[in-house]
């Protein structure tokens, strides 16, 4: 297929990516599925500049990103390397806190009200951000 030159309706273009900002809440897994059905993924933050862009659009609201440690180590949903990549955790985070009383720890990352990151219970219904790269946005996968 040919490359998409602009983002879909209701998506915002920034630095060769398209972003969609929810106005309601879902659990992390449901938000992840939503983005995947949009041929996208939960937002992967790779730079301070991208962090500022997303933060500007979401405002002071808890919002899921595509970062989790449900299988052990922290991983970005698109395979971006976590260890060497950009991070913006709040002080003392992530802490995998068990004191919330909901069972288990905290395995999913979200933007907090000041934009810095926190790990939280993945079932919490937070807003979310989807991202897709412009050059991917209209390419057809091969038929199986």
């Amino acid at each position: 297929g040919s490359e998409r030159t602009c983002c879909p309706v209701n998506w915002v273009e920034h630095e060769r990516s398209c972003y969609w900002f929810s106005r309601s809440g879902k659990a992390w897994a449901d938000a992840d599925n939503y983005c995947r059905l949009e041929d996208a993924h939960l937002v992967v933050v790779t730079s301070w500049e991208e962090q500022k862009f997303v933060q500007h659009h979401i405002g002071p609201v808890n919002t899921w990103m595509g970062l989790h440690d449900q299988n052990g180590p922290w991983k970005w949903v698109d395979g971006t390397d976590y260890e060497t990549g950009f991070k913006n955790w709040r002080p003392e985070q992530p802490d995998d806190w068990y004191g919330h009383g909901l069972g288990g720890g905290e395995d999913c990352a979200h933007f907090t009200d000041d934009g810095r990151w926190n790990d939280d219970v993945c079932q919490r219904p937070y807003r979310w951000v989807c991202e897709t790269e412009l050059d991917k946005a209209s390419q057809e996968p091969p038929l199986l």
Partner: antibody
Framework: EVQLLESGGGLVQPGGSLSLSCAAS????????MSWVRQAPGKGLEWVSA????????FYTDSVKGRFTISRDNSKNTLYLQMNSLRAEDTAVYYC?????????????WGQGTMVTVSS | DIQMTQSPSSLSASVGDRVTITCQAS??????LNWYQQKPGKAPKLLIY???NLETGVPSRFSGSGSGTDFTFTISCVHPEDIATYLC?????????FGPGTTVDIK
């Protein structure tokens, strides 16, 4: 006119296979999430599977995982459902349905349905 | 999976009556709820999406409300052509699930 037209249903023995097609017209097919929904005789509706607009991501209800495969050919405006290892409980009318933009699970356009009967 | 329940399972109404159907989700689905009309031998027809949004071309006598786990569907003034089964459906969570339906007939 916006339209979905299913085909490929029929009678098949348990363990057999069947391939359903859904031809779309009147809208930009590649831009929409598409789903298959089925209805067993005298029963309620059951969502079966969904596929993203480019076809890169697919989802299934647990009872058909590993047996059914959803796919699409956007150059032909056609949605498919390959059904293998069919069971008696798969007997149903199968509908293809188009999701609303941004509300993938709200189905605003439905086909007329195609009947699949699994029986020996 | 999220379970959807509806009540009543059937009802009889006179032409001009106001009819109310309720739908309950087994957990919070915010507003990710749709209502469909299905007539015998036909495909469902979307009436209401996102709990309260009227689908284009659907008469304004149909309306929906609610959020969280409890939702209501109303026909403000029943017409003879409204004889059908009405189904709620959630799409907060995969798999998308439907209620069992409420059958409306005319007295």
């Amino acid at each position: 006119e916006v339209q979905l037209l299913e085909s490929g249903g029929g009678l098949v023995q348990p363990g057999g296979s069947l391939s359903l097609s859904c031809a779309a017209s009147g809208f930009t097919f590649r831009s929409y999430v598409m789903s298959w929904v089925r209805q067993a005789p005298g029963k309620g509706l059951e969502w079966v599977s969904a596929i993203s607009g480019r076809g890169s991501n697919t989802f299934y209800t647990d009872s058909v995982k590993g047996r059914f495969t959803i796919s699409r050919d956007n150059s032909k405006n056609t949605l498919y459902l390959q059904m293998n290892s069919l069971r008696a409980e798969d007997t149903a009318v199968y509908y293809c349905a188009k999701g609303i933009t941004g509300s993938h699970g709200a189905f605003d356009i439905w086909g007329q349905g195609t009947m699949v009967t699994v029986s020996s | 999976d999220i379970q959807m329940t509806q009540s009543p399972s059937s009802l009889s109404a006179s032409v001009g009556d106001r009819v109310t159907i309720t739908c309950q989700a087994s957990r919070d689905i915010t507003f990710y709820l749709n209502w469909y009309q299905q007539k015998p031998g036909k495909a469902p027809k979307l009436l209401i999406y996102d709990a309260s949004n009227l689908e284009t071309g659907v008469p304004s006598r149909f309306s929906g409300s609610g959020s969280g786990t409890d939702f209501t569907f109303t026909i403000s003034c029943v017409h003879p052509e409204d004889i059908a089964t009405y189904l709620c459906q959630q799409y907060d969570n995969l798999p998308f699930t439907f209620g069992p339906g409420t059958t409306v007939d005319i007295k």
